[in-house]
């Protein structure tokens, strides 16, 4: 059991001791303690290096020391005449006589006490990696800030691991580096790039100091690459010992620096990049590589572009080259395509047309293209003859690539309106007569088709409703039919500038500028229902002559009917505008001066009570063309009149041929480019 | 939005006149037309007749040829109906109706005027 | 002028069943392959309601258990099923030459 004192004395002290004689005592005091071990008393023989008799003392391993001869105090007021500190709670004391004593040796007497050790100061091995603290009995450790103590409550480390980098360039450095790098840690970094690119670290000799390796070889602090089943290292010493360029072949790396608890250098700093995978430089017959490079990586992107009458067939799409690939297994994207014969496929089919399927579609190849007659024609001329050109393209002579545009034919009615009967005072109609015609329902009115994507109507009839229902192709705007025929939706509105919007519209004197166009949002397809009317031309061949006789449609007011549901016709002569002005307005709403005549009016009407009423808003006044008797053109627009059954007023369309033309322009889509 | 607001009841003398009005509102009377019907007490609708406010063409019914007077004013979107040397016959509800985008129907109605004829 | 019979003043059915309306003309009212037959709903002081137009044609808005049928003198209007809130005058009108005319206005009760 330890004790914390106790008393040793030789055998028969203070007798002299015996011949022959080996005694051992084992002295222990509690863990924690050391030993104060001192003689008040030493008389044995004495001999060279204490040969013959002896009192030795043992700590461990190491003699602390070994006593004969005799010894007195130096120190009046101490009877010690010898003792020893150990910082250890044991401790052996052997005392050894030979066979013959001279002369008679009384032998010793010692004592020994429990003493606190400094376990911070007291050992070569200092017991704490960084802050000891002592107290009676034991000691504890401690760390500086932003370290922690490892579980054997001895060291101290850092927390210098969990980092993953994912740049494709970065740099990595030991903790606190250049300072010294923590002692007793374990660091580990991860780089984890993309596929297709490799981990390659650069180092500098100069930017590496690890503690160096012991005397086997072995090192002490060590900084290793672990790339899948590659390791590069472990690495330590002044000066970066491996090879400055570490290519990995791997997209993912695992460095871990490892310290022990002695030998704090100023650590290491390294580079990475991401290299990229290679790929071959592959032989593609009939073909050019752009750019030609001799050497290609992940990522590289090259145009293969096939000599001209060869190209790439990939599903049912020619093309005259492709872009390849280096992916990041090192292989190239697309390797199936190669670069064959030219078959220019199966030609584009073009809007409102045909063409005919091809006995052939390689090299050399003729096509014809054909509008949809006798709605459509061919506008951009060319014939519609295409042969399959050296680059993959059906190509005609006139037009190149550039597909036939068929657009609608204007001005021709399907079958010409024939008077049956004496609008007002007209005859029942078929919307074959005017394919043109276009029913408004809100407010109840007409306009003129004169493209697949505009329509043109009088100003006032849209000025309250900018998003109005309109229907094409059925001579009954009975609801049943309607819902058969095609219903138009708008996208814009555009209204003349001249057009004045008033606040209160009942009240209006003036019609001048009484035009709009409508734009929609689909294109109309033509028939022999539905298709436009000519606009004029801006020759005085076009000027209106009194006599000159148009066709008015609608569904308007009739003698019978506030609203038509079968479609009504009439022709008119053009009359001169004083007939108009002379007619008393039925209703005015201010004098009869007030209302305004302007050139941009055409006054018809006048014969046998025929005229537009009410409802007929914005139909065409349509006119044989004077240089085409087969196509009518649109000359006025129903606008206003003063007395239903009299004269009408009709807006003179040629006076705003180069309006329309320029909104349309200015509000077309591509596809009517 | 569609609506038809018609002027309040009316309780006149016999032998008197009374104007009833309609006045529009989301659209314009002058694009349209105003008809008018009669409702008496717990009897069935009757047709008085029509105008077009664009132009005041009316159609009347030959039973009001004499009774009603239908006028519109476009200025005010307003449509009023004159009713003349009224009776207790003349008792009733008097509606304005239109006919919309339809051609010979009429999916807007006022609310309609009471007319009570009374000594 | 076109004299309208409906040939009956009251009509009672029950919830769920069919409700037929009949009206019959003095003379045709169909114009160039039309027929200028409407019918309405009115309840107790309100306004009349329009159900079909053109004989045929349902009102937008009109539940579709609404139908109407018929040409030249003689009209149908059905109710298949019919409901509580269908309770109601129903009158056919015919606008196809003046005077325009109403008919009697038979009363619909549910059972």
């Known amino acids: 059991e330890p004790t914390m004192y106790g008393e040793i004395l030789s055998p028969n002290y203070p007798q002299a001791y015996p011949s022959e004689v080996e005694k051992s005592w084992d002295i222990e005091v509690p863990e924690g303690y050391g030993i104060h071990l001192y003689f008040t008393h030493l008389d044995i023989e004495l001999s060279e290096n204490c040969a013959y008799d002896s009192v030795q003392i043992i700590s461990g391993d190491t003699e602390e020391g070994r006593l004969c001869g005799q010894r007195s105090s130096n120190n009046p007021h101490s009877p010690i005449v010898e003792e020893f500190q150990v910082p250890y709670n044991k401790l052996q004391v052997i005392f050894k006589s030979d066979f013959s004593n001279e002369e008679r040796f009384t032998g010793f007497a010692a004592y020994y006490v429990a003493t606190d050790i400094n376990e911070c100061t007291d050992f070569v091995d200092v017991p704490c990696s960084h802050f000891c603290n002592n107290f009676i009995g034991g000691y504890f450790c401690s760390c500086p800030p932003e370290y922690f103590l490892h579980d054997d409550m001895k060291n101290c480390g850092v927390n210098c691991s969990g980092d993953v980098f994912t740049a494709l360039i970065g740099e990595i450095a030991s903790p606190n580096y250049p300072k010294p790098y923590p002692e007793n840690s374990r660091c580990e970094y991860q780089i984890r790039l993309e596929k297709g690119f490799q981990v390659v670290v650069t180092l500098r000799r100069e930017d590496f100091d690890v503690e160096a390796a012991d005397s086997a070889g072995n090192c002490l602090d060590s900084l290793v690459f672990v790339a899948g089943d590659r390791q590069f290292g472990p690495y330590c010493g002044h000066g970066f010992p491996g090879p400055l360029n570490i290519e990995t072949k791997s997209n993912a790396l695992d460095i871990i620096f490892q310290t022990d608890l002695t030998g704090q250098k100023k650590g290491w700093k390294l580079r990475y990049h991401g290299d990229p995978m290679p790929c071959p430089k592959e032989d593609t017959p009939n073909s050019v590589w752009e750019p030609a490079k001799a050497k290609y990586v992940f990522r590289d992107v090259v145009q293969i572009t096939c000599l001209d009458g060869f190209e790439v067939v990939e599903g049912r799409v020619g093309a005259t080259s492709f872009y390849s690939t280096c992916q990041s297994n090192g292989k190239w994207s697309n390797s199936k395509l190669k670069c064959q014969p030219v078959d220019c496929g199966i030609p584009e089919s073009i809007e409102n047309g045909k063409v005919e399927d091809p006995e052939s579609t390689l090299f050399g190849s003729v096509i014809r293209y054909t509008c949809e007659e006798p709605y459509y024609y061919m506008e951009n001329g060319g014939g519609g003859e295409y042969h399959c050109a050296g680059n993959g393209s059906w190509v005609n002579e006139v037009l190149g690539p550039e597909l036939p545009k068929c657009v609608p034919v204007c001005g021709v009615p399907r079958e010409p309106f024939e008077e049956k009967q004496r609008i007002i005072g007209g005859s029942d109609a078929d919307i074959k007569n005017f394919p043109w015609q276009v029913f408004f329902d809100n407010p109840w009115a007409g306009g003129a088709l004169i493209n697949e994507y505009w329509v043109l109507t009088a100003a006032h009839v849209v000025e309250g409703n900018r998003e109005p229902t309109m229907y094409v192709g059925s001579t009954s705007v009975q609801t049943s039919r309607l819902a058969k025929s095609k219903m138009l939706t708008p996208e814009h509105v555009f209204i003349h500038p001249g057009w004045k919007l008033l606040e209160v519209p009942e009240g209006r004197t003036n019609f001048d500028n009484d035009i709009a166009l409508v734009r929609l949002k689909d294109p109309v397809k033509m028939g022999p229902t539905v298709s436009p009317i000519c606009l004029p031309g801006t020759s005085s061949d076009y000027n209106l002559m009194d006599g000159d006789l148009g066709l008015i449609s609608g569904w308007g007011r009739t003698e019978k009917r506030d609203r038509a549901v079968r479609l009504k016709a009439a022709r008119l002569p053009v009359a001169p505008l004083r007939k108009c002005k002379e007619v008393k307005v039925e209703k005015p709403t201010a004098d009869a001066e007030a209302y305004v005549f302007t050139p941009n009016m055409i006054c018809a009407g006048g014969e046998k009570g025929m005229d537009s009423c009410k409802g007929d808003s914005g139909g065409a006044f349509a006119v044989q063309d004077p240089n085409d008797k087969t196509k009518f053109y649109a000359a006025g627009l129903v606008s206003w009149g003063p007395q239903c059954g009299t004269y009408g007023l009709y807006t003179r369309v040629k006076n705003y041929v180069d309006w329309i033309m320029k909104t349309m322009q200015e509000n077309s889509t591509p596809r009517e480019d | 939005e569609v609506k038809l607001e018609q002027s309040g009841a009316e309780l006149v003398r016999p032998g008197a006149s009374v104007k009833l009005s309609c006045t529009a509102s989301?659209?314009?009377?002058?694009?349209?037309?105003i008809h008018w019907v009669k409702q008496r007490p717990e009897q069935g609708l009757e047709w008085i007749g029509r105008i077009d406010p664009a132009d005041d063409h009316t159609k009347y019914a030959p039973k009001f040829q004499d009774k009603a007077t239908m006028t519109a004013d476009t200025s005010s979107n307003t449509a009023c109906l004159q009713l003349n040397s009224l009776t207790s016959e003349d008792t009733a509800v008097y509606y304005c109706?239109?006919?919309?985008?339809?051609?010979?129907?009429?999916?807007?109605w006022g609310q309609g005027t009471l007319v009570s004829v009374s000594a | 002028f076109a004299l309208m019979t409906q040939s009956t003043d009251y009509l009672a059915v029950s919830l769920g069943q069919r409700a037929t309306i009949s009206c019959k003309a003095s003379q045709s009212v169909d114009y160039d392959g039309d027929s200028y037959m409407n019918w309405y709903q009115q309840k107790p002081g309100q306004p009349p309601k329009l159900l079909i137009y053109a004989a045929s044609n349902l009102e937008s808005g009109i539940p579709t258990r609404f139908s109407g049928s018929g040409f030249g003198t003689d009209f149908t209007l059905n109710i298949h099923p019919v409901e509580e809130e269908d309770a109601a005058t129903y009158y056919c009108?015919?606008?196809?030459?003046?005077?325009?005319?109403f008919g009697g206005g038979p009363k619909l009760e549910i059972k």
């Open positions: 009108q015919q606008s196809n030459e003046d005077p325009w005319t």
């Open positions: 989301g659209f314009n009377i002058k694009d349209d037309y």
């Open positions: 109706a239109i006919y919309g985008s339809g051609w010979a129907w009429f999916p807007y």
